[in-house]
């Protein structure tokens, strides 16, 4: 048992049908020490008395706000989470596995530039009594500082019969370089709370390989004379890590019809323009990544060839 | 601890393209190592973040772009002198903070250099012969330290009378492909960069 | 007392489909992630699905993934895997578990 | 996918005897190992989790050790009704996989 919180306990279960499950000893927060007594959330049955309360925490419904009172007064309480261990590994049932870009992917994290900012987010199928908190760091072993701010309900999906809620959080490290070459992982860890269930979820991981730039900006075509070809030019996003000569972007250009089917023609480049061919009821689009590190395109930027 | 504005004219720079195939070497040999090694912590998930170049050279810092001099997050430096004469310094006006950017490098390719040859002397020497250095990926080093063209006494080849453990010296190997990477990219940076400016 | 039951099995033809339940009694259901596993004639076990106690995470063996179909109702306590275009490979006893307890198995036979 | 190589694949012992058999996993799986006892015509029944911790009501003369890629079922002495097929499993990444099985007899 450890405390999550001020009054806040977590339980940790090897959670299996019939499994022994754990004693627990509470203690009342009192300098009192007669005609203390015992009760578990909102029932008035009396379940023990004294100072301490040894309890066998076995299932849910021996968790919960455990209250001792003296002669109707609440002296405090002690709010009983479990975290379950099935088969020894935690359990992970309040997020749902994203499985990208592999198994048991349950925190998805981005950044759009090499500044230490960086964008987690997490999926789930439970709309109520739910609570996340969420800290990060630089390293574990000697950690340095990253912070977050609040997670927050970012998305809502339907998903064939069940509503999919996306929660994210904003970090930020606290002294980062971008020209910096990582060697220590950000380390990310949520708690999750859903009822009386604990759970946590980690990820780790450099910035260089969360990289995701925002589209190229001010996509824009040129006509060139006598000639069905078009110059596509545009810019690096305004979110992407200065000075450019440094963090250099690299692009893909497309030219898409207006069935899928249709053969998609594709130019990479390293300069902000390009001459293509354009069909009619075509359009171009362009993407960016990384020159020298491939990490993720970003996001299409469109315009209709007409 | 940074790279002036007024550097060599653009296109005139001649590490730029030497620098490009370091990248496409060294990230292609890591690429191999890791789909020959695939039963090997050979990911970076898996493996240790090493620096072989820690506390002997400073190539991030000194060759910092002068936009990133005002983040003092970037500023958190060791101390670290070099040898200053170069050919990739196609100017006169070349400043000595560009020099020591530049041999910072020199020494970064000349330690790995070192590090691959001695490692691929031990893997000639597996039975399995599972994995060899790309030469090609040698040859690309020497050809870039070469138009770096820095005076710097020769590091003699590290020879071990040991038996060889092959396992983890495929580790190391990991090891050091992964930050090699790395630090080409950087390089590859900063050669972008002194080509712009 | 833990009990596990599966039924559904039977005789169907390759291309058919099956639905198995299990029928889980004597622990708190709901609580609970659970499995199914099968075990061909004569040969050794083999995982064919899983999923956690609130359905959020459900994973398939590549052997049946697009075929086979796992879901739970835990109102009713009961397991279910639909298992639909049917072949011959796919015959064996299929258990439902939560370890450490393991259903009876159901046999599946597919043959024309 | 992750093998498990168990090994032997069958054995001949006495009651009595002290039994051990192993698993090879062929990448690292931690602890995150299973070992399973089925009888002929029987539903398999769990023994071992974690590699190394006891299912309540199993006896402790069943012992599983190991981490990474070596595992080990042991049975102290032998009993008339351990004679069955064991099972190694990994549940440290999906697809979960088996061992191929140890059928232990009667000599």
């Known amino acids: 048992i450890w405390e999550l919180k001020k009054d806040v306990y977590v339980v940790e279960l090897d959670w299996y049908p019939d499994a022994p499950g754990e004693m627990v000893v509470l203690t009342c927060d009192t300098p009192e020490e007669d005609g203390i007594t015992w009760t578990l959330d909102q029932s008035s049955e009396v379940l023990g008395s004294g100072k301490t309360l040894t309890i066998q925490v076995k299932e849910f419904g021996d968790a919960g706000q455990y209250t001792c009172h003296k002669g109707g007064e609440v002296l405090s309480h002690s709010l009983l989470l479990l975290h379950k261990k099935e088969d020894g590994i935690w359990s992970t049932d309040i997020l749902k596995d994203q499985k990208e870009p592999k198994n048991k992917t349950f925190l998805r994290c981005e950044a759009k530039n090499y500044s230490g900012r960086f964008t987690c987010w997490w999926l789930t199928t439970i709309s109520t009594d739910l609570t996340f908190s969420v800290k990060s760091s630089r390293g574990s072993s000697d950690p340095q500082g990253v912070t977050c701010g609040a997670a927050t309900l970012s998305a809502e999906r339907v998903r064939g019969d069940n509503k999919e809620y996306e929660y994210s959080v904003e970090c930020q490290e606290d002294s980062a370089c971008p020209a910096a070459e990582e060697s220590l992982p950000i380390e990310v860890m949520v708690d999750a709370v859903h009822k009386l269930k604990y759970e946590n979820y980690t990820s780790s991981f450099f910035i260089r390989d969360i990289i995701k730039p925002d589209p190229p900006k001010n996509l824009q075509l040129k006509p060139l004379k006598n000639s069905r070809q078009v110059e596509v030019s545009w810019e690096y996003p305004d979110t992407w890590s200065t000075p450019h000569s440094y963090f250099s972007l690299t692009f893909c250009v497309q030219v898409q019809g207006k069935s899928k089917r249709e053969k998609k023609d594709r130019v990479f480049t390293d300069k902000t323009s390009a001459t293509v061919i354009c069909r009619k009821n075509a359009s171009i689009s362009v993407r960016a990544q990384d020159r020298y590190y491939s990490s993720s395109w970003s996001e299409w930027a469109s315009v209709p060839c007409s | 601890r940074n790279l002036p504005v007024a550097t060599p004219d653009p296109g005139m720079f001649p590490c730029l393209h030497h620098s490009q195939n370091l990248l496409r070497a060294v990230s292609n040999m890591l690429q191999k190592a890791r789909q020959t090694l695939e039963f090997y912590p050979c990911t970076s998930e898996e493996i240790d973040h090493e620096d072989i170049t820690k506390d002997k050279t400073s190539t991030v810092e000194a060759c910092l772009p002068l936009e990133l001099t005002k983040n003092e997050s970037c500023l958190n430096s060791r101390e670290t002198s070099f040898i200053t004469n170069g050919s990739c310094l196609a100017s006169r006006k070349t400043s000595f903070m560009m020099a020591l950017c530049l041999s910072s490098i020199y020494e970064d390719l000349k330690m790995y250099q070192v590090e691959f040859k001695t490692m691929n002397a031990k893997l000639l020497m597996d039975p399995k012969r599972q994995i060899f250095l790309d030469q090609n990926m040698l040859a690309v080093i020497d050809e870039l330290m070469q138009a770096l063209n820095f005076n710097s006494e020769t590091v003699p080849q590290k020879s071990s009378l040991e038996e060889p453990d092959f396992y983890k010296t495929k580790i190391k190997l990991c090891i050091l492909l992964h930050a090699f990477r790395i630090r080409a990219v950087t390089i590859d940076r900063v050669m972008s960069y002194l080509n712009a400016s | 007392e833990v009990q596990l039951v599966e039924s559904g099995g039977g005789l169907v033809q390759p291309g058919g489909s099956l639905r198995l339940s299990c029928a889980a009694s004597g622990f708190t259901f709901s609580d609970y992630g659970m499995v199914w596993v099968r075990q061909a004639p004569g040969k050794g076990l083999e995982w064919v699905a899983s999923?956690?106690?609130?359905?959020?995470?459900?994973y398939y063996a590549d052997t049946v993934k697009g075929r086979f179909t796992i879901s739970r109702d835990n109102a009713k306590n009961t397991l279910y895997l639909q298992m639909n275009s049917l072949r011959a490979e796919d015959t064996a006893v299929y258990y439902c578990?939560?370890?450490?307890?393991w259903g009876q198995g159901t046999l599946v036979t597919v043959s024309s | 996918d992750i093998q498990m190589t168990q090994s032997p694949s069958s054995l001949s012992a006495s009651v009595g005897d002290r039994v051990t058999i192993t698993c090879k996993a062929s990448?690292?799986?931690?602890?995150?190992v299973a070992w399973y006892q089925q009888k002929p015509g029987k539903a398999p029944k769990g023994l071992i989790y974690s590699a190394s911790h006891r299912y309540s009501g199993v006896p402790d003369r069943f012992s599983g050790s190991g981490s990474g890629t070596d595992f080990t079922l042991t049975i102290s002495s032998l009993q008339p009704e351990d004679f069955a097929t064991y099972y190694c499993q990994q549940y440290n990444s999906y697809p979960l996989t088996f061992g191929g099985g140890t059928k232990v007899e009667i000599k």
């Open positions: 578990a939560r370890n450490p307890y």
């Open positions: 990448q690292n799986v931690g602890t995150n």
């Open positions: 999923i956690s106690s609130g359905s959020s995470n459900i």
